[in-house]
Interface confidence: low
Amino acid sequence: FKIETTPESRYLAQIGDSVSLTCSTTGCESPFFSWRTQIDSPLNGKVTNEGTTSTLTMNPVSFGNEHSYLCTATCESRKLEKGIQVEIYSFPKDPEIHLSGPLEAGKPITVKCSVADVYPFDRLEIDLLKGDHLMKSQEFLEDADRKSLETKSLEVTFTPVIEDIGKVLVCRAKLHIDEMDSVPTVRQAVKELQVYISPKNTVISVNPSTKLQEGGSVTMTCSSEGLPAPEIFWSKKLDNGNLQHLSGNATLTLIAMRMEDSGIYVCEGVNLIGKNRKEVELIVQEKPFTVEISPGPRIAAQIGDSVMLTCSVMGCESPSFSWRTQIDSPLSGKVRSEGTNSTLTLSPVSFENEHSYLCTVTCGHKKLEKGIQVELYSFPRDPEIEMSGGLVNGSSVTVSCKVPSVYPLDRLEIELLKGETILENIEFLEDTDMKSLENKSLEMTFIPTIEDTGKALVCQAKLHIDDMEFEPKQRQSTQTLYVNVAPRDTTVLVSPSSILEEGSSVNMTCLSQGFPAPKILWSRQLPNGELQPLSENATLTLISTKMEDSGVYLCEGINQAGRSRKEVELIIQVTPKDIKLTAFPSESVKEGDTVIISCTCGNVPETWIILKKKAETGDTVLKSIDGAYTIRKAQLKDAGVYECESKNKVGSQLRSLTLDVQGRENNKDYFSPE
């Protein structure tokens, strides 16, 4: 018969596993099996026989099973024996990588690679690699005879660098029992390297400065280098040395700072492996408050006005105010203080207010004083121009330029100009100490001419206080000159004529030159010499004239400068009528008597009177004086018909009478033949 074993001759078993060794026969129906170790030590297993097979089960395998096991099969009288060498090992887990601490760039670190429960160690090899680089390899040959499960380690110390980030540490353990392929003889552990950098180069930037004023603000920004990026923590050092946490942000902003905010501020950059701090000292200084006085360091105030002086404080929350004059005279004003402003109202401003006023501000234990000079002036109205009379060409006139209620007088200048020409200038330099409102005048006399008309007479008053700010510093009044010219060259135009027929119309136009344009006045001279005003129109029109309209008419040109007149005689002619032809003393006289033959035309002036004596041989024109013909010592031949013709441009009228001359001798009348 034959004997066979499974496995055939060698079994590699891992401690703790269950191992079965099988022994079987062929060619023997009822074999008898027995198992023993080569050195007759305990089997440390359980045998089960079944027919032609015997199984030795060792569960679990331990060091007590590391023997050469012999199976003996007895078939009747024959014995067969076959051995199986049981070898044990232990390699149950992957290695473990341990770091002595976090990987900090630049700081040495120990890497420990441990392989637990290994047997046999003399077959163990551990390799430690960083990336592809073998850092260390170790075999454990020294303790070959010890039968125990042990943890074997390999340690390497190295200094990480930034470039190690992302690399892997590989711990590879090999148990050199690889005669049989089925046993995993290599185990490994992998660890990715995370290299840290402890915070360093912590920097604080302070804006605007570490020296600050009360009420100001500061922004402090902190940065720190490290891996991972450090977290930033701001704290303040308290008097007892403790830190008071302020913020977990890189930027710390402190606003409306007070003096108690002075101190040391700490910025700490913190990451997993360390911290780094930087300190900065902030000094909050008491804010230098400022005082402003308005309207300015000096103010020009017009007497009678209301003036408000304002004292304003910046940089002090609750100031106290006081006002005084530089010479500690009464304030003569009303003070009102509220918050950071105080006002002193002087109303109305008078001479007693001409001082330097001081505003004293107290803030805490500090005092500040600001002054304002109140300078007075009075220059309320424009100058007044007055003249002694109207301006008449060639006649002198006195111009007065009056500036009312002026102060200070010593700064006043008055100037009189005609057009661009300065006529007079005066400065009032005296009276410097007088504190009163005065009226000041400039007077001058000049002779106006026609050419001055239309020119401006300017009175300019200047108050020379340029160092005071007020408007106006200059006032002026202007008067346009109109120089009067007395009427002259007065003329009358009569249309159609000054001699007219009764019933016709006449226009009499009067022209007179002067400035201002003369007013025209038409009058008629009455027989008693008085003037009867007729019209103020330049043209006097008479319609349907009558003889009574005849007479002397006067045209008068009148203006402020004088008057000028022109006379015109108007003659209204009518056809002669009411002719009277008389003989005086009678129409019948004696020879030798004196006879006056008189012809009158009572209603018509300007007629020609023609006296004639009619005769057969022809008429004789008699020389008459004013229509009267005197026959001295009448003769008989003087008897006859006398004719009077009253004649003018318009017409004529005849009258006749018969003169009878009686002879003295025979008392006969003599009649001239008709």
Epitope: L246, S247, G248, L252, T253, L254, I255, A256, R258, E260
Partner: nanobody
Amino acid sequence: QVQLQESGGGSVQAGGSLRLSCTASGFTYSSYYMSWVRQAPGKGLEWVSGINVDGSNTYYADSVKGRFTISRDNAKNTLYLQMNSLKSEDTALYYCATGSGRDSYDCYSGSWCPKGQGTQVTVSS
């Protein structure tokens, strides 16, 4: 205008508890760090506790660490301070205060800060 109204103060025996509340209005509460500060009789303002905008970071003075808890409810615009194991030295007027922005604690040392009228906490032994 920033308005803060504290409530929840009162008198309590040493070892007892109180919960203070502060209701905020007039500003975007959820954008500001918030603090609790207190003023003991005759003393200056003392910073007690602070919380960041979303409540993820809280900070405490050493004197209250482990006893007080700060929290906030941005939906209700409310800040809380849970005070446990109260001691007589916790007696003070408690104010809630806001910083000037999301990165600032202006009330860290009792300097300027918008704060409410305060709520009185009295702890008797």
